[in-house]
Interface confidence: medium
């Protein structure tokens, strides 16, 4: 079976964002006031090394209220 | 049309291991995530795992994580879930699921763990 | 943590409409969209609504489903016996804990 590389590019990057985030959207890179290391944007967090579920979830984004 | 079949279910000892299988048929399956759900005996459902399409990422329930291993074959449209370490509370059926958002899911295998 | 309320049993005479509730809050239903799973006895899951209120084909639009704050809805009208079934509302990878429908006759 193939082992994973535990990094998200591309497409594959989307889709698990689109399952992490349940369709609220998501965002490529924080807010600044969200994130510690402002310059890091997901690709590189999560394509150039290996991110989990948790760190996904911080991109997406959170709508004004409700209906 | 679509189908999922599960199977390597059975009777295991505490602290001992498992590898269920998912075979797939009917869809392209390298353009869809996969994830494994499970239903404890009476109980409801609880999300185990998921492994995006191309199989280059992984995640896990807290209640599984560092025991139990997701990987897909894409040469062999399946699907597949390592259980280490098993506790008498991982006993349920086990069931694989389509995409992000489950819309098709196999028959289940019974994973039972006692002694 | 997430966490989708449901309540545990729900009843309705044939010909009937029902609805199954599940409660979370701002953060979870209020943001992310909801899904619903029919589980009839015996067998495994379906996705019976997703996105709220879309549903996939081949499922009768006796099924329809609503979001409206922080609670979504899962109603049945013109109930029939082979409705007797769990239904589970989830949003990504977290379910509520199910309901039991009762067709009652």
């Known amino acids: 079976a193939y082992r994973p590389s535990e990094t998200l590019c591309g497409g594959e990057l989307v889709d698990t964002l689109q399952f992490v985030c349940g369709d609220r959207g998501f965002y490529f890179s924080r807010p600044a006031s969200r994130v510690s290391r402002r310059s890091r944007g997901i690709v590189e967090e999560c394509c150039f090394r290996s991110c989990d579920l948790a760190l996904l979830e911080t991109y997406c984004a959170t709508p004004a209220k409700s209906e | 049309q679509v189908e999922l079949v599960e199977s390597g279910g059975g009777l295991v000892q505490p602290g001992g291991s498992l590898r269920l299988s998912c075979a797939a048929s009917?869809?392209?399956?390298?353009?869809?995530?996969m994830s494994w759900v499970r239903q404890a005996p009476g109980k409801g459902l609880e999300w185990v795992s998921y492994?995006?399409?191309?199989?280059?990422?992984?995640g896990y329930a807290d209640s599984v994580k560092g025991r139990f291993t997701i990987s897909r074959d894409n040469s062999k449209n399946t699907l597949y879930l390592q259980m280490n370490s098993l506790r008498a509370e991982d006993t349920a059926v086990y069931y694989c699921?389509?995409?992000?958002?489950?819309?098709?899911w196999g028959q289940g295998t019974l994973v039972t763990v006692s002694s | 943590d997430i966490v989708l309320t449901q309540p545990p049993s729900v009843s309705g005479a044939p010909g009937q409409r029902v609805t199954i509730s599940c409660t979370g809050s701002s953060s979870n239903i209020g943001t992310y969209d909801v899904h619903w799973y029919q589980q009839l006895p015996g067998t495994a899951p379906k996705l019976l609504i997703y996105s709220n209120s879309k549903r996939p084909s081949g499922v009768p639009d006796r099924f329809s489903g609503s979001k409206s704050g922080t609670s979504a809805s899962l109603a049945i009208t013109g109930l029939q016996s082979e409705d007797e079934a769990d239904y589970y509302c989830s949003i990504t990878r977290v379910f509520g804990g199910g309901t039991k429908l009762t067709v009652l006759g």
């Open positions: 699921a389509r995409g992000t958002k489950f819309d098709y």
């Open positions: 009917g869809f392209t399956w390298s353009s869809f995530a």
């Open positions: 492994i995006s399409y191309l199989g280059s990422y992984t």
